[in-house]
Amino acid sequence: YDFTNCDFEKIKAAYLSTISKDLITYMSGTKSTEFNNTVSCSNRPHCLTEIQSLTFNPTAGCASLAKEMFAMKTKAALAIWCPGYSETQINATQAMKKRRKRKVTTNKCLEQVSQLQGLWRRFNRPLLKQQ
């Protein structure tokens, strides 16, 4: 999906009002210095591309974050403020339902959410280019 035509200010507002708080809640009890950020993003479409991939793609040691509150709110924000996003996600959502597993907060998941926080902060930077 090409995130170029999203309403970035509306997504930023959603992040500031709720998503950021849900990310903090998920990370509660973790020191902010515990994980090194190894990925970043260039402009807002890039940030959303990486946020969507990191949030919804299973990775080694962290099977799924998709059912977490921050992930559901991220998905809702993208569906509302990125034209055509919902249609591209139908097949992906069906596949995700098939492989849904019991939620377990592993250290790898905490590390992944720490990376997500960094990507969202970068998205939120006032000087970041729209595209």
Epitope: N36, N37, T38, V39, S40, C41, S42, N43, P45, H46, T49, E50, S53, L54, N57, T59, A60, Q112, Q115, L127, L128, K129
Partner: antibody
Framework: QVQLQESGPGLVKPSETLSLTCTVS?????????WSWIRQPPGKGLEWIGY???????SYNPSLKSRVTISRDTSKNQFSLKLSSVTAADTAVYYC??????????WGQGTLVTVSS | EIVMTQSPATLSLSPGERATLSCRAS??????LAWYQQKPGQAPRLLIY???SRATGIPARFSGSGSGTDFTLTISSLEPEDFAVYYC??????????FGQGTKVEIK
Amino acid sequence: QVQLQESGPGLVKPSETLSLTCTVSGYSISSGYGWSWIRQPPGKGLEWIGYISYYGSISYNPSLKSRVTISRDTSKNQFSLKLSSVTAADTAVYYCARTNLLYFDSWGQGTLVTVSS
Amino acid sequence: EIVMTQSPATLSLSPGERATLSCRASQSVSNNLAWYQQKPGQAPRLLIYDASSRATGIPARFSGSGSGTDFTLTISSLEPEDFAVYYCQQYSDWPQYTFGQGTKVEIK
């Protein structure tokens, strides 16, 4: 300390597909960072080709996108480049590099690929 | 596509002298700029990122400055091992990261 090593044929015929592999040691490619390909034609500057992130997102240079595929094999700690329909203009030293998706902090030593019949 | 223009193409200096390399972007890249050093037959090495932050292990004689469209890499006192080609790279314009054409610093 992370080390990267490119491997693959040094000579490719025009119209064929260039295939290179980067083997990473000292760091798991599924643990963090992005893993990128960059090329440098002889005596010229650098051109970014694309990356695959540790979580699988892929990004390509738009000027090469129609011909490029980057993939990975986490079991071997390797990532690969395929460039189709090559011409003499694709003759270059090809580097693999570690990236934070913005800039490139560790590089392989590079491998020269010549496109010629 | 953002075009990065480096000047001069070649800089002839003696060890101990100060080197000032310029990189200009065709449009603003904020501080999203990196500098690399490349010696003959070797891969590039990251020197500076975010326009002014030194990469791990890079000596203090290397410094970067600038924002927007005009950037400078300064080598305060050239060591023999600093004679090389230097490239700037912008990362403001994903997915079109671009490099400058390079500045060669040679021994006078």
